[in-house]
Interface confidence: low
Amino acid sequence: KVFGRCELAAAMKRHGLDNYRGYSLGNWVCAAKFESNFNTQATNRNTDGSTDYGILQINSRWWCNDGRTPGSRNLCNIPCSALLSSDITASVNCAKKIVSDGNGMNAWVAWRNRCKGTDVQAWIRGCRL
């Protein structure tokens, strides 16, 4: 599923991401834009053999199990395929664990490079939330 910007903002808000660990909703929408272009089925393989899955590009080295990443920790205790669902519950729940891990949203390279320090509220402007 490819979400619309405001559609995703509303879904993320429903799932409790607005101001989760101090990160406003705009940060999450911005991260999703530059990680996956709002596509729940986005996957990207990394040169270390791991793969990033879903709308927030969650990595199989640490957070989920895809059965083919040596040394995977599966800290979210989920199959990576769950992160590709049009239902973003699994991605949100795992993202909450990631952002609580100490580095905050810096765990997402796209957020660090494209969203951090920018006017992230622009990503929810005009949305009926």
Epitope: Q41, T43, R45, T47, D66, G67, R68, P79, C80, L84
Partner: antibody
């Protein structure tokens, strides 16, 4: 050991549809992407798309959207590619491969001939 | 789409020669470049993954190098079994794309 066994050669008429199968053995089928690749003489190798059997997630090369449809049956460890509205341009060898970004394991190929 | 251009299209060599095959990408693909060998009426076989990592069971005479947009497959002292087609492939972005191939033939 990992093996991908594709279905046999097909001769089809223009306008018809065909379904090619790829049976996987020797690994956990549901967690690896199955890729589909087309090869025509003089046209090299073309990536058609991929399916993740465990979730049914698919990605298609824009060029093949509407032409190819991927499905997978995890109970039989078999992936399928259906090609519709066949024309002579679809005559080719079609390969399935196990995807890891790179393709370390390939099926033997299915030769499709479209002829009236 | 990322275009991969292979050169030369055909390379005529004598067994024992050492050769280099080139693959150039239309934009940077980091190290997400892989090489395959294909003999007539056979499936492609992975030789090198991620520019320089040898695939399992591949002879040490095959090696890869490069980064960004320019990549090379080298064969040190070609053997008769090495003749065939060689393709590069990128996995940096979708759609995955292949080069047009280099035919390695006996002189």
């Amino acid at each position: 050991q990992v093996q991908l066994q594709e279905s046999g050669a097909e001769v089809m008429k223009p306008g018809a549809s065909v379904k090619i199968s790829c049976k996987a053995t020797g690994y956990t089928f549901s967690t690896y992407w199955i890729e589909w690749v087309k090869q025509r003489p003089g046209h090299g190798l073309e990536w058609i798309g991929e399916i993740l059997p465990g979730s049914g997630s698919t990605y298609y090369n824009e060029k093949f959207k509407g032409k190819a449809t991927f499905t997978a049956d995890t109970s039989s460890n078999t992936a399928y590619m259906q090609l519709s509205s066949l024309t002579s341009e679809d005559s080719a060898v079609y390969y399935c491969a196990r995807g890891d970004g790179h393709y370390g394991y390939w099926g033997q190929g299915t030769t499709l001939t479209v002829s009236s | 789409d990322i275009e991969l251009t292979q050169s030369p299209a055909t390379l005529s060599v004598t067994p024992g020669d050492s050769v280099s095959l080139s693959c150039r990408a239309s934009q940077s693909i980091s190290n997400n470049l892989h090489w395959y060998q294909q003999k007539s009426h056979e499936s492609p076989r992975l030789l090198i993954k991620y520019v320089s990592q040898s695939s399992s069971g591949i002879p040490s005479r095959f090696s890869g190098s490069g980064s960004g947009t320019d990549f090379t497959l080298s064969i040190n002292s070609v053997e008769t079994e090495d003749f065939g087609m060689y393709f590069c492939q990128q996995s940096n972005s979708w759609p995955r794309t292949f080069g047009g191939g280099t035919k390695l033939e006996i002189k």
